[in-house]
C-alpha cells in the first residue's frame, strides 16, 4: 500500500493524486551485491531447451533495454545433440514492473507499467489431446 | 537514462536532485491486454525441471508480494518419471526493478532497487571438471 501520514523525515507530497503519485529516487540500489555465478552462466546454451536473447529497446521506458528470450527449437535437445520433438521447449514468462514516461517524452514523470517478458526456456511434456 | 527538456505539459521538478528524483504514478498500467495462454500454463509441473513457487513478502517493497521459484530436484525428470542425476535442474534468474520505501516506513518516497528473482527452472547438462 502507498500513502498518507505526516511522518517526520518523510518527503511531503501535496500532489492532488496523492497517494497514487510518489517520489522515486532513480539511483538504483543493487541488492545483488555479490556477482551470482549462476546468473551470469551459460544456461541458455547448456539447457535442453536452449534460447537466444534479443534486445528490446524503448526510450520511453525505464529501463530502456530489456533482454527477451526466444527458444531455439520447438522440441528439446537430447544427450546426443538431436532435437526430440516429443517434448516442447517453452518460454518461461514473468510479469515485471517498468517505468513508462507519462506524459510521453517528459523527463521526470512516469507511470508504473506491468509488462510480460520471456526470461528463458524450459522443456515440458506436451499436453496430448486424445480424439474420441 | 532519465532527463532534461522543458516540455510544456510536463510536471515541473525543482528538486535539487533532479533528474534523479522523479514522480511516479502507481496506478499500474497493464500492457498484457490479451490473456496469454502460455503464461497461465502449468509449466512448473510439466517441466523436466519442475519447480514450486514460494510467496516472498516484504511490506517495505513495492510490489510487496513476489512469487519465487525453487527447483524440486537436483536432477531432471525423465520420461519414466524418475530423476536423472546426470543432468541438473537450475533456476532461471532475472534481475527486476522494485520500489523500496526510503526512508523506511515513509508512505510516498521510494528508491528504485534491483533484486534477483528465480522465475522457473530449466534442465542443463552439467559442467564436468576433468582432473588431470
Amino acid at each position: 500500500g502507498i500513502a498518507i501520514p505526516r511522518n517526520s523525515g518523510c518527503p511531503n507530497s501535496e500532489d492532488k493524486n496523492f497517494p497514487r503519485t510518489v517520489m522515486v529516487n532513480l539511483n538504483i540500489h543493487n541488492r545483488n551485491t555479490s556477482t551470482n555465478p549462476k546468473r551470469s552462466s551459460d544456461y541458455y546454451n547448456r539447457s535442453t531447451s536452449p534460447w537466444n536473447l534479443h534486445r528490446n529497446e524503448d526510450p520511453e521506458r525505464y529501463p530502456s533495454v530489456i533482454w527477451e528470450a526466444k527458444c531455439r527449437h520447438l522440441g528439446c535437445v537430447k544427450a546426443d545433440g538431436n532435437v526430440d520433438y516429443h517434448m516442447n521447449s517453452v518460454p518461461i514468462q514473468q510479469e515485471i514492473l517498468v517505468l513508462r514516461r507519462e506524459p510521453r517524452h517528459c523527463p521526470n514523470s512516469f507511470r508504473l507499467e506491468k509488462i510480460l517478458v520471456s526470461v528463458g526456456c524450459t522443456c515440458v511434456t506436451p499436453i496430448v489431446h486424445h480424439v474420441a | 537514462g532519465i532527463a532534461i527538456p522543458r516540455n510544456s505539459g510536463c510536471p515541473n521538478s525543482e528538486d535539487k536532485n533532479f533528474p534523479r528524483t522523479v514522480m511516479v504514478n502507481l496506478n499500474i498500467h497493464n500492457r498484457n491486454t490479451s490473456t496469454n495462454p502460455k503464461r497461465s500454463s502449468d509449466y512448473y509441473n510439466r517441466s523436466t525441471s519442475p519447480w514450486n513457487l514460494h510467496r516472498n513478502e516484504d511490506p517495505e517493497r513495492y510490489p510487496s508480494v513476489i512469487w519465487e521459484a525453487k527447483c524440486r530436484h537436483l536432477g531432471c525428470v525423465k520420461a519414466d518419471g524418475n530423476v536423472d542425476y546426470h543432468m541438473n535442474s537450475v533456476p532461471i534468474q532475472q534481475e527486476i526493478l522494485v520500489l523500496r520505501r526510503e526512508p523506511r516506513h515513509c508512505p510516498n518516497s521510494f528508491r528504485l532497487e534491483k533484486i534477483l528473482v528465480s522465475v522457473g527452472c530449466t534442465c542443463v547438462t552439467p559442467i564436468v571438471h576433468h582432473v588431470a
Epitope: G1, I2, A3, I4, P5, P19, L97, K114 | I28, T35, R39, S40, D42, Y44, N45, N52, L53, H54, R55, E57, P59, E60, Y62, P63, S64, V65, W67, R101, H105, P107
Partner: antibody, heavy 119, light 107 residues
Framework: QVQLQQSGAELVRPGASVKLSCKAS????????MHWVKQTPVHGLEWIGV????????AYNQKFRDKATLTADKSSTTAYMELSSLTSEDSAVYYC????????????WGQGTTLTVSS | SIVMTQTPKFLLVSAGDRVTITCKAS??????VAWFQHKPGQSPKLLIN???NRYTGVPDRFTGSGYGTDFTFTISTVQSEDLAIYFC?????????FGGGTTLEIK
Amino acid sequence: QVQLQQSGAELVRPGASVKLSCKASGYTFSDYEMHWVKQTPVHGLEWIGVIHPGNGGTAYNQKFRDKATLTADKSSTTAYMELSSLTSEDSAVYYCIRFLTYEGYFDYWGQGTTLTVSS
Amino acid sequence: SIVMTQTPKFLLVSAGDRVTITCKASQSVNNDVAWFQHKPGQSPKLLINYASNRYTGVPDRFTGSGYGTDFTFTISTVQSEDLAIYFCQQDYGSPYTFGGGTTLEIK
C-alpha cells in the same frame, strides 16, 4: 464485472472432509491471487491461505496448514479449498477473496459458504 | 500475527449523523489498511484501501485516515442504506488480520 460465486451450504459429519468451491468470472483468473478466510462468532475473520492460479503457488496461515488444502482449476476458473478431519470447530462461514498481487490489497469477495459440522 | 483492535463494536445512530470507527494495529502496518462494508445477504465490499484511498465508485461520505498503528474510518453523513457491519483489515503482511467489526444500526 468481477464475480466470485461460492458453492452452497454444507452439513457434514465430524471426521469427514469437504471441498468448497469459488467460481471466478469477469477477469483473467490466472492473473490474481485467491485467498480464503474463515468467519466465526468467536474468532471473527481469520486468514487461511492463498493460491496463485497462474503459477500454482500456495501459502498458508500456520494455524490452518494441516486443515486446509488450496487448489485451482484454470480451465473452469474455479478455486477450491478442501478441509479435512472436520470437527465442530470448523463450523464457520468461509469466504474466497481476490487479491491484487502488485497493488497489495483485497478487492472482491465471494458471498460465503456456510459449513456446519455436526453428527 | 498483527492484532487489529476495532472500536466500537456497536453504533446506533440517526440518519444524518457523523460516524467514526477506529482501528488500532498491534504494530506499525504503514498505510496498508483497508475498510470493508458488509451488508446482510451480500458479499463484503471494499470501501477504502491504503488507509485513505477511496475505492472506485465509493461515495465521498466515506473517508479513511491514519498511518502506522492508528486508523480512523468516518461516514460524514450517515444514510439509511449504510446499515451494515464495517471492518478494518491489514494487508501489511500475512497472516492478514481483521478487526472485529462494527455493527452500524440506524434509529
